[in-house]
């Protein structure tokens, strides 16, 4: 947020940039939270735009019985690992095909025991305020589907008829990590010392970090003809004086006619 200064007063302005503002030769360059010629004003809204998507990662272990373990499988650049990865990925894509949040799998380690596959199931969803519920539901479906396939696709007489077969007892969910996004926390942090006065309000499922000085929200402060200004003690209305009236009161809703004051009379609207 920048305000340009022209003329002789500029040099004086340079030394007067407030709130961490820096002079660039023409104007005060203000930090995110401030604006104005001297960076003296506190912004009324802060962009905490959520990420477009939120991710989750499930750490799973399954035991594949239709492939015999060889040492080459430990080496991620070997042809053996690459072929195993291709088949395993195709199989898991089929298993999880009905889950819209499913992105793919990432094998982290293959070890002996037929082939014990340590892997991550990757999930992603568009950001909405309900993203946690959406991803929690998706992780439950992942558990159901992997349990089902590892119970159904099993070896019979040392032969597998499916793309892959599994050991029913070898399926484990180790850990679930969801990318944390807390708009309230982000809003508080970014508002710094004004954090007590900034709140998150939603519009079209998008969070807005605003102070009461931002118009058009349920917490907005109505200063009538005055101007809302944020200070460390909270939002305040700075009341204006017109040619005919003085305005006062917490929301500048009390107008006093000048002519009546000069005539020693007070008149309130």
């Amino acid at each position: 947020r920048t305000t340009t200064c022209f003329g002789d007063g500029c040099q004086n302005t340079a030394s007067r940039c407030k709130n961490g503002g820096t002079w660039d030769g023409l104007k005060c360059q203000c930090p995110n939270l401030y604006y104005g010629e001297l960076c003296e004003e506190v912004v009324s809204s802060i962009d905490i735009g959520p990420p477009e998507t939120i991710s989750a990662q499930m750490e799973l272990t399954v035991t594949v019985t239709s492939v015999k373990f060889t040492e080459e499988l430990k080496n991620h650049s070997s042809q053996e690992f690459q072929e195993f990865k291709q088949t395993f990925t195709e199989q898991m894509n089929i298993v999880y095909s009905g889950i819209p949040e499913y992105v793919g799998v990432n094998i982290t380690k293959l070890r002996l025991g037929s082939v014990v596959v340590e892997h991550d199931v990757l999930l992603r969803t568009k950001y909405t305020p309900e993203y946690k519920t959406v991803l929690d539901n998706a992780t439950e479906v992942v558990k159901e589907k992997i349990t089902k396939v590892t119970t159904q696709q099993i070896m019979i007489n040392d032969i597998c008829s499916d793309m892959m077969c599994f050991n029913t007892t070898g399926t484990q969910v180790q850990n679930i990590t969801v990318t944390q996004y807390d708009p309230e926390e982000d809003c508080r942090k970014m508002a710094k010392e004004y954090g007590d006065y900034f709140v998150v309000e939603y519009r079209d499922q998008k969070p807005y970090c605003i102070s009461p000085c931002e118009p058009g929200f349920s917490v907005s402060k109505n200063c009538n003809l005055g101007k809302c200004q944020m200070s460390l003690s909270g939002p305040q209305c700075l009341c204006v004086t017109t040619e005919t009236h003085w305005y006062s009161g917490e929301t500048c809703n009390q107008g006093t006619q000048k002519s009546l004051v000069y005539g020693h009379h007070h008149h309130h609207h």
């Epitope: 492939v67 015999k68 088949t87 032969i159 597998c160």
Partner: nanobody, 123 residues
Framework: EVQLVESGGGVVQPGGSLRLSCAAS????????WGWFRQAPGKEREAVAL???????FYADSVKGRFTISQDNTKNTLYLQMNSLRAEDTAVYYC?????????????????WGQGTMVTVSS
């Protein structure tokens, strides 16, 4: 990348014999799994005979005692000796390979394929 080329297909009378060969390029012949699959018109591809580097072999019930799978590592070649051929053996026969030691009949688990050779058993 493993390249597989089948040969030896043809027309034979019921009860006759054929020997299919599959020549492989690359140095992977001594590892993994090798197999013969077939696909009859209008049917799914099915496993006929499989062999792995750990000595495991598999034969489909319909060919047991009639077909024999073998390999010559020095020539990088896989064979399928087919005896007592029947009309129901008519199909395109495919050679398949994987560097993995497989125990699966499902074609989707096999990574490398030849173009196929036609076997017709007819009187």
């Amino acid at each position: 990348e493993v390249q597989l080329v089948e040969s030896g297909g043809g027309v034979v009378q019921p009860g006759g014999s054929l020997r299919l060969s599959c020549a492989a390029s690359g140095d992977t012949f001594s590892r993994g799994s090798w197999g013969w699959f077939r696909q009859a018109p209008g049917k799914e591809r099915e496993a006929v005979a499989l062999i792995s580097s750990d000595g495991w072999t598999f034969y489909a019930d319909s060919v047991k005692g009639r077909f024999t799978i073998s390999q010559d590592n020095t020539k990088n070649t896989l064979y399928l000796q087919m005896n007592s051929l029947r009309a129901e053996d008519t199909a395109v026969y495919y050679c398949a390979a994987s560097v993995l030691v497989l125990r699966t009949l499902n074609p989707k688990a096999w990574h490398h394929w030849g173009q196929g050779t036609m076997v017709t058993v007819s009187s």
